[in-house]
């Protein structure tokens, strides 16, 4: 038994055919000590007297709010709830599994940006007598706050005879640091109470695979003279992180008719325009997605190709480009060749997600993700990495940076990968271990040397840990990457010459 | 299944124009863009233009253009491609294609080889 | 016009091996970049489209990477009927072009 809140109570129960249940004693929260009577919810039949009560728990009857008397006079309350664990797996009965995406996901979190805020929501057939309530942290063993709000309930749909009910909540974190690379992972757990049965569910992740921009706005159409083609063009969405030059999105662009079936036209790009074929009664549409990181795209922003005019959606700046002043050229170092450091840099995003694509879909947090790959160099918040710290002194990032890939470059060189089972040269793995050095020697010319970080050794010894492990290394790349992208594209398009 | 049959073997002299057909089956006609991708002897492929069956669109690479038109005739689901002023260098062999995406090509015909000499 | 540029022109491997193709575009076309695969006397067959997206009915040895200017295909594990020409082509605007191709040779 444990204390959820103040005077409710948690009984947790193997739930099976005659088992014995708990023995639970409640003390009566009072000074007094004779004449003390207990009763169960709204029933007047005394159950025991004194000031503790023992009973044992078996099943839900046992459960609700016990309540200790003196003389008619209401002493305390304890609330007892039940948590059934069925076969070793706690019940999961309140929550609908939303099997996406996969199963056993009962909440799923999105966030529009990478400023710490996110929204979680879950679905239920319930709808009386619940309540959840949200707690959140980055990490688990040393955490650091996030806050929540009140869960609310945010739909409600009919699904066949069924009515469907979604809650959402928003948590921010509260020392966020958008433009770091997350080491820990979010934590979210919801407790849920519907009657006097008690569930808890949590989520683990990171606010960079969550991501999923809102559409692109104010999508505007140009007709081109003597041609069937249209420019159109758009804006990156007011919730985007900012500046989009650190912060950048890729785009797709689609002619559909109203039917999925019919012809289509699809392009995708970098810019915040592209041309495209219009036909009469299709529509144009532009979806974003994060340019370094394989994220969720965004839903669709659409325009009909007959209107030329604008969609819904205000003014704002789009593009990539960065604003404000030029950077100023790097004390105490030369500035490095950020255009082609750019260049190698998204290739390296490329690779990184094509080495093992089914990285981004597995779920390794439960393989014990912080004792393998907590030795892994991290872009932390203190790294000067952000687009204030690269206009300050930019050295101190591309130190970092140099040392990220350097250390990669020796892991993806070492047994992990080079043992069983064997991967050849020229695998998207070979190719990228020859880009993470190419990009290191890009920041680190002959003669000018900074300290390099200890590989660690991690030498698995059967081939499926070796495999374990790289999918590992391999997603910890891929957000590296991502963050060293976003600086050097940051760099081209402010501190260049 | 969806299938492009083209038009025999074309032998031309410099100067003529020459007319390929390309004759689609196993799906709606208007639902796909028809491509023409020609092929020189031993060389690479060149995209030539697109056609919209369902209203006549048309699009063609700059190198073609005043020199191409493409046609279709929906109740036989037959796709034309005219080439005029040959020249001994439009000696290729000529394939139509057929996408619902417009800017790749995902069914081929068989190709009409088309010779030009005089 | 956006120019394609395939490397090597041939490519001699021996049947097993892994065989990594090239293209590379004359400015950034994001990753529109299709893969194509012709053998002698026959009309060309799309492998990959949109640089990584498979196609089905086609063996998975057959993979396509690469974003911006620089692009891949890698036959993982070449079989007897893989020797033929592939061809990558630019769909990020009119006109469309593809490049020289790349022949692929048994050693």
């Known amino acids: 038994i444990w204390e959820l809140k103040k005077d409710v109570y948690v009984v947790e129960l193997d739930w099976y055919p005659d088992a014995p249940g708990e023995m639970v004693v409640l003390t009566c929260d009072t000074p007094e000590e004779d004449g003390i009577t207990w009763t169960l919810d709204q029933s007047s039949e005394v159950l025991g007297s004194g000031k503790t009560l023992t009973i044992q728990v078996k099943e839900f009857g046992d459960a609700g709010q016990y309540t200790c008397h003196k003389g008619g006079e209401v002493l305390s309350h304890s609330l007892l709830l039940l948590h059934k664990k069925e076969d070793g797996i706690w019940s999961t009965d309140i929550l609908k599994d939303q099997k996406e995406p996969k199963n056993k996901t009962f909440l799923r979190c999105e966030a529009k940006n990478y400023s710490g805020r996110f929204t979680c929501w879950w679905l239920t057939t319930i709808s009386t007598d619940l309540t959840f309530s949200v707690k959140s942290s980055r990490g688990s063993s040393d955490p650091q706050g996030v806050t929540c709000g009140a869960a609310t309930l945010s739909a409600e749909r009919v699904r066949g005879d069924n009515k469907e009910y979604e809650y959402s909540v928003e948590c921010q974190e509260d020392s966020a640091c958008p433009a770091a690379e997350e080491s820990l992972p979010i934590e979210v757990m919801v407790d849920a109470v519907h009657k006097l049965k008690y569930e808890n569910y949590t989520s683990s992740f990171f606010i960079r695979d969550i991501i999923k921009p809102d559409p692109p706005k104010n999508l505007q159409l140009k007709p081109l003279k003597n041609s069937r083609q249209v420019e159109v063009s758009w804006e990156y969405p007011d919730t985007w992180s900012t500046p989009h030059s650190y912060f950048s999105l890729t785009f797709c662009v689609q002619v559909q008719g109203k039917s999925k079936r019919e012809k289509a036209d699809r392009v995708f790009t970098d810019k915040t325009s592209a041309t495209v074929i219009c036909r009469k009664n299709a529509s144009i549409s532009v979806r974003a997605q994060d340019r370094y990181y394989s994220s969720s795209w965004s839903e669709w922003a659409s325009v009909p190709c007959s209107g030329s005019g604008s969609s819904r959606g205000g003014s704002g700046s789009g593009g990539s480009g960065g604003g404000g002043s030029k950077l100023r050229a790097v004390p105490g170092g030369s500035s490095p060749a950020w255009t082609q450091c750019q260049q190698l840099s998204q290739k390296l995003c490329t690779l990184a997600w094509s080495a093992h694509p089914l990285v981004g879909h597995m779920d390794l947090r439960e393989e014990g993700d912080e004792e393998t790959t907590n030795d892994v160099p991290h872009i932390q918040c203190g790294d000067g990495c952000d687009p204030q710290g690269l206009r300050d002194n930019s050295q101190f990032c591309l130190q970092r940076i140099h040392q990220g890939l350097i250390f990669y470059e020796k892991l993806l060189g070492s047994d992990i990968f080079t043992g069983e089972p064997s991967l050849l040269p020229d695998s998207p793995v070979g190719q990228l271990h020859a880009s993470l050095l190419g990009l290191s020697q890009l920041l680190q010319p002959e003669g000018h040397h900074w300290e390099t970080q200890q590989i660690p050794s991690l030498s698995p010894s059967q081939p499926w840990q070796r495999l374990l492990l790289r999918f590992k290394i391999l997603r910890s790349l891929q957000a590296f990457v991502a963050v060293a992208a976003r600086v050097f594209a940051h760099g081209a398009a402010t501190l260049s010459p | 299944q969806v299938q492009l049959v083209q038009s025999g073997a074309e032998v031309k002299k410099p100067g003529a124009s020459v007319k390929v057909s390309c004759k689609a089956s196993g799906y709606t006609f208007t639902d796909y863009y028809l491509h023409w991708v020609r092929q020189a002897p031993g060389q690479g492929l060149e995209w030539m233009g697109w056609?919209?069956?369902?209203?006549?669109?048309?699009e063609y690479a700059p190198k073609f253009q005043g020199r191409v038109t493409m046609t279709t005739d929906t109740s036989t689901s037959t796709a034309y491609m005219e080439l005029r002023s040959l020249r001994s260098d439009d000696t290729a062999v000529y394939y139509c294609n057929a996408n619902k995406e417009l800017r790749y090509f995902d069914v081929w015909g068989q190709g009409t080889m088309v010779t030009v000499s005089s | 016009e956006i120019v394609m540029t395939q490397s090597p022109a041939t490519l001699s491997v021996s049947p097993g091996e892994r065989a990594t193709l090239s293209c590379r575009a004359s400015q950034s076309i994001s990753i529109n970049l299709h893969w194509y695969q012709q053998k002698p006397g026959q009309a060309p067959r799309l492998l990959i489209y949109f640089a990584s997206q498979s196609i089905s009915g086609i063996p998975a040895r057959f993979s396509g990477s690469g974003s911006g200017t620089e692009f891949t295909l890698t036959i993982s594990s070449l079989q007897s009927e893989d020797f033929a020409v592939y061809y990558c082509?630019?769909?990020?605007?009119?006109?469309?072009?593809f490049g020289g191709g790349t022949k692929v040779e048994i050693k």
């Open positions: 056609i919209d069956p369902e209203n006549g669109d048309t």
């Open positions: 082509q630019q769909s990020n605007s009119f006109p469309l072009t």
